[in-house]
Every structure is written in C-alpha cells, then in structure tokens.
Interface confidence: medium
C-alpha cells in the first residue's frame, strides 16, 4: 500500500522533521505550510486549520519561504553616490551599489551601506593597488626612474624617457625633458613598460599588484571623513 500523504496541518512523527516548505509551529505543535516569497502569514495555523498567507504590501518584501506576521521593509532609496542595481519588489529588497569612482566602505547583507570616493594618488605617487568594489586605491611613491604627474585613482608610475641629451632630469612627479629629437623609453626597475606614443601622458592600464616597501597608504575610516593619506588627495 502506498504511504498516506499527510495534509497540513499534521503532527510529525517523533524525531522527524516537517517536509519542504513546511515548518513546525511551536504553538499548534503541528507541521504547517510556509508562505511563499512575496507573502507573509496573515493567520497562523492551528491544530485544525493551515497557515493563511497574504501578499506583501508596497515597499515590503519576503525573499524566503516564511511564516512571518509582517513582510520586511525595503531599504531606503539609494543615495546620490549609489546606483540601484535591484529594485524593491514583493520578493526582493532594493540593492544599492556604489557608482563608478567610488567603493563600498561599509557593506550590508546585499549591496552597500556607505560608499566612499576612490583615493586619488597625487603627483609623485602612482597606484600600487587599484580600487575594487570593496577596497580603496593604494598609492605608492614612484621609484627612481619612474614618475607620475597626475592626480588620479588609476594612473601608475611610468618610466622616464631616456634622452640623448637631458635638458631637465626627471623626478618622481615629472618626466625627463630632452633636447634631443629622438627620446627613447627606459626599462627602469619596478616600472611597468607599456609601449605607447611619447606624447601620451595618461596611463589607465591596471597595474599588477606588487609588494611595496613604502608604508601602506590605504586605511579605512567609515565613521566620518578621513584626512588624505600620504600621496593621495581628497579632491
């Protein structure tokens, strides 16, 4: 004979759990139906009647099969430094993520609670580690033979040009100036060599993360504005 299918509510066998999409109600001491995502329990089950479910109201949701008496409130609207990547519906909460040029300084279950602008490395400093969705840019001083003359959250230190005759030697924040008409590029130690026209001055290629002997300039202060780190600017 086939096993008899129990209809909710029913008393579970000792030591057994309720079936999928059911829960054990402590008060009724019965296995009862859960409400589907987008719904909540309007009336809890009893020994003789099953859970009565109702749809979530506007701006509320349930993402899981549940038996909560009220749906959860969707989060507040996304702030100006955020993008809404998932709208509030009856089955899912609103998700806000940081817009380009910003990173998440304080995350929550899904999305971001607090965004902060990516650090910009000032001239003489280049990007040692690029920013990600959840971490800030790390700046490092440009090593000898390399420079950065920009204030940027993406530019790395680039090698000085090699001159036949040097008019002005390069430093950490300025390229060498040549009197010769045919400068070449050096392969300075620690520099990323990227073939490009000499006139190009802005390099947006993401660098390969490397250990730096310079002190880390990345620190996180989600509670209020932070002073600019060494080699960075808040602009």
């Amino acid at each position: 004979l086939p096993a008899q299918v129990a209809f909710t509510p029913y008393a579970p066998e000792p030591g057994s759990t309720c079936r999928l999409r059911e829960y054990y109600d402590q008060t009724a001491q019965m296995c009862c139906s859960k409400c589907s995502p987008g719904q909540h329990a309007k009336v809890f089950c009893t020994k003789t009647s099953d859970t009565v479910c109702d749809s979530c109201e506007d701006s509320t949701y349930t993402q899981l099969w549940n038996w909560v008496p009220e749906c959860l409130s969707c989060g507040s609207r996304c702030s100006s430094d955020q993008v809404e990547t998932q709208a509030c519906t009856r089955e899912q909460n609103r998700i806000c993520t940081c817009r380009p040029g910003w990173y998440c300084a304080l995350s929550k279950q899904e999305g971001c609670r607090l965004c902060a602008p990516l650090r910009k490395c000032r001239p003489g400093f280049g990007v040692a580690r690029p920013g990600t969705e959840t971490s800030d840019v790390v700046c490092k001083p440009c090593a000898p033979g390399t420079f950065s003359n920009t204030t940027s959250s993406t530019d790395i230190c680039r090698p000085h040009q090699i001159c036949n005759v040097v008019a002005i030697p390069g430093n950490a924040s300025m390229d060498a100036v040549c009197t010769s008409t045919s400068p070449t590029r050096s392969m300075a130690p620690g520099a990323v060599h990227l073939p490009q026209p000499v006139s190009t001055r802005s390099q947006h290629t993401q660098p390969t993360p490397e250990p730096s002997t310079a002190p880390s300039t990345s620190f996180l202060l989600p509670m209020g504005p932070s002073p600019p780190a060494e080699g960075s600017t808040g602009d």
Epitope: T17, E22, Q26, N66
Partner: nanobody, 124 residues
Framework: ELQLVESGGGLVQPGGSLTLSCAAS????????IGWFREAPGKEREGVSC????????NYADSVKGRFTISRDNAKNTVYLQMNSLKPEDTGVYHC?????????????????WGQGTQVTVSS
Amino acid sequence: ELQLVESGGGLVQPGGSLTLSCAASGRFLEYYAIGWFREAPGKEREGVSCISMSAGSTNYADSVKGRFTISRDNAKNTVYLQMNSLKPEDTGVYHCASEPYGCDDGLLRGYDYWGQGTQVTVSS
C-alpha cells in the same frame, strides 16, 4: 535549504558547564534566526534561546535566563550555547533549529530545519 549539525553534549554534574555548537550551512543563512530547543522524556518540546544571524539580537526562555548565553560566529557560520550552572531539569536532547527572519520578538515561533540533536545529561 539549510543543514544544521549540533555537537558538544555530554554528561555533567549539577552546577557544571557545557558549550553546545550548531554548525549551519545553506543559502541565505544571514536572513535566519538560529535557535535551540530541547526535548526530554515526558516533557513538551521547549524553546531555550535564539539569535538573529544578521543583527545578533538574542532571546532566552525564563528557565535559562542568566545561566545560558547564545552567541554566533558568522565567519564560521556557527552558533554556540554556553550553559552554566546546569541543573538536572536541563537534561534532554538539545536541537538547533532555524526560522527565517525570526528571533526579534521572542523565542522562535517554529522551526523549518532542525538537526539530529545532542544529548545533555545533568546528573551526579
């Protein structure tokens, strides 16, 4: 679906201590409350304590307040029940169980997943 595995039970003398662990796994775990209930022969199933995995809010049955402490380690997806000043009436099989979005308004109303349980015996 969630999986819950309890450990840490044993035999202890009255006045002694034990710490139970509940290792949880599954999707959306942060949306759940994890609670403990106990079963003893001839007694009704009794809710002991629960904790919200996201907010960390906790609740306790009157019978264990001041003696039991529930805590969570979200990195390990584990909930702990530290039981001090144990009494013979604390004897039973302790199960950890889950409830979506629960625990803010008292002990778990119900459970949708629960583990096999771990035996706690308080006896001299």
